[in-house]
Interface confidence: low
């Protein structure tokens, strides 16, 4: 799916109002410095491509994110603010259901969601110059992490 026609401001609003909080809830009990951000994105469409991939595509060690609250809200945001997105996801969703295993929060899933948090923050600051993983440690990160 080509994310270039999405209503980025609306998706950003959905992230700030709900998705970010659900990501934090999922990561509760995990230190913000525990995982290094190895996935990045260069612009908003690219960020959404990466976000979709990490959220909905089962990966080795983490096949259970698609039913998490943040994932369902991400799907809703993309379905409404990206014209034509929902049609492209019907077959993908069916395949995902077959591949999904029991809902278990593994360390690999926590790492994957940590990467998602980084991608979402990049999505919200698309004009930020890339400086490797350090640009995920900005002042506003305190709004997105629990420190335990």
């Amino acid at each position: 799916y080509d994310f270039t026609n999405c209503d980025f401001e609306k998706i950003k609003a959905a992230y700030l109002s709900t998705i970010s909080k659900d990501l934090i809830t999922y990561m509760s009990g995990t230190k913000s410095t525990e995982f290094n951000n190895t996935v990045s994105c260069s612009n908003r469409p690219h960020c959404l491509t990466e976000i979709q991939s990490l959220t909905f595509n089962p990966t080795a060690g983490c096949a259970s994110l698609a039913k998490e609250m943040f994932a369902m809200k991400t799907k809703a945001a993309l379905a409404i603010w990206c014209p034509g997105y929902s049609e492209t996801q019907i077959n993908a969703t069916q395949a995902m259901k077959k591949a999904r295993k029991s809902k278990v929060t593994t360390n690999k899933c926590l790492e994957q969601v940590s990467q998602l948090q980084g991608l979402w923050r990049r999505f919200n600051r698309p004009l930020l110059k890339q400086q490797g993983s350090s640009d995920y440690k900005d002042d506003d990160d305190k709004h997105h992490h629990h420190h335990h």
Partner: antibody
Framework: EVQLQQSGPVLVKPGASVKMSCKAS????????MNWVKQSHGKSLEWIGI????????SYNQKFKGKATLTVDKSSSTAYMELNSLTSEDSAVYYC??????????????WGQGTSVTVSS | QIVLSQSPAILSASPGEKVTMTCRAS?????MHWYQQKPGSSPKPWIY???NLASGVPARFSGSGSGTSYSLTISRVEAEDAATYYC????????FGGGTKLEIK
């Protein structure tokens, strides 16, 4: 107060086209999507499609692709739906409905009063 | 496209009775909305996202369900509840159920 004011009833001949309007007020027009829904006499609701006044992006029910065209005029906060090649099957009441994010789900929270379209020779 | 099937098509109840109508989806959906429509009027949002009552909806209404099966229940039916109720999903585009017409005896 959110209001959606739809254009009046129309009587058209088979094969003709019709363009109906839905004027929005009481909220920022570009903040929410606009749905169009068909209701034939005594029948259920049928979703036609959705448009984003923000970027003009549309998504259609496969059944109505080629039949309905959704557009908006941001300057007048008005959504339009054009139906072409009309037949008696298109005789129905057509609603516009604003869609907003509420309670973890996008719902059609405000509806227009409906535009009645009668196709008859 | 996800198909929503509502049952029963017509439901007849006496005032004070408890009634339940169901909505089944052809594949799993995240949430279900419900709308009420009376003859000659536009549909009104009635229950948001499976279980949240819209503004002004009496507390005798409730909604529940998950996956492919959802329901709307009225604990004690009143005459003013006579209407057609439609379920609607948005997980994959948007579709409505065929409606359940509630008649009061």
């Amino acid at each position: 107060e959110v209001q959606l004011q739809q254009s009046g009833p129309v009587l058209v001949k088979p094969g003709a086209s019709v363009k109906m309007s839905c004027k929005a007020s009481g909220y920022t027009f570009t903040d929410d999507y606009m749905n169009w829904v068909k209701q034939s006499h005594g029948k259920s609701l049928e979703w036609i499609g959705i448009i984003s006044p923000y970027n003009g992006g549309t998504s259609y029910n496969q059944k109505f692709k080629g039949k309905a065209t959704l557009t908006v005029d941001k300057s007048s906060s008005t959504a339009y739906m054009e139906l072409n090649s009309l037949t008696s099957e298109d005789s129905a009441v057509y609603y516009c409905a604003r869609e907003d994010y509420d309670y973890d789900g996008y719902a059609m929270d405000h509806w227009g009063q409906g535009t009645s379209v009668t196709v008859s020779s | 496209q996800i198909v929503l099937s509502q049952s029963p098509a017509i439901l007849s109840a006496s005032p004070g009775e408890k009634v339940t109508m169901t909505c089944r989806a052809s594949s799993s959906v995240s949430y279900m909305h419900w709308y009420q429509q009376k003859p000659g009027s536009s549909p009104k949002p009635w229950i948001y996202a499976t279980s949240n009552l819209a503004s002004g909806v009496p507390a005798r209404f409730s909604g529940s369900g998950s996956g492919t099966s959802y329901s709307l229940t009225i604990s004690r039916v009143e005459a003013e509840d006579a209407a057609t109720y439609y379920c609607q999903q948005w997980s994959s585009n948007r579709t409505f159920g065929g409606g359940t017409k509630l008649e009061i005896k």
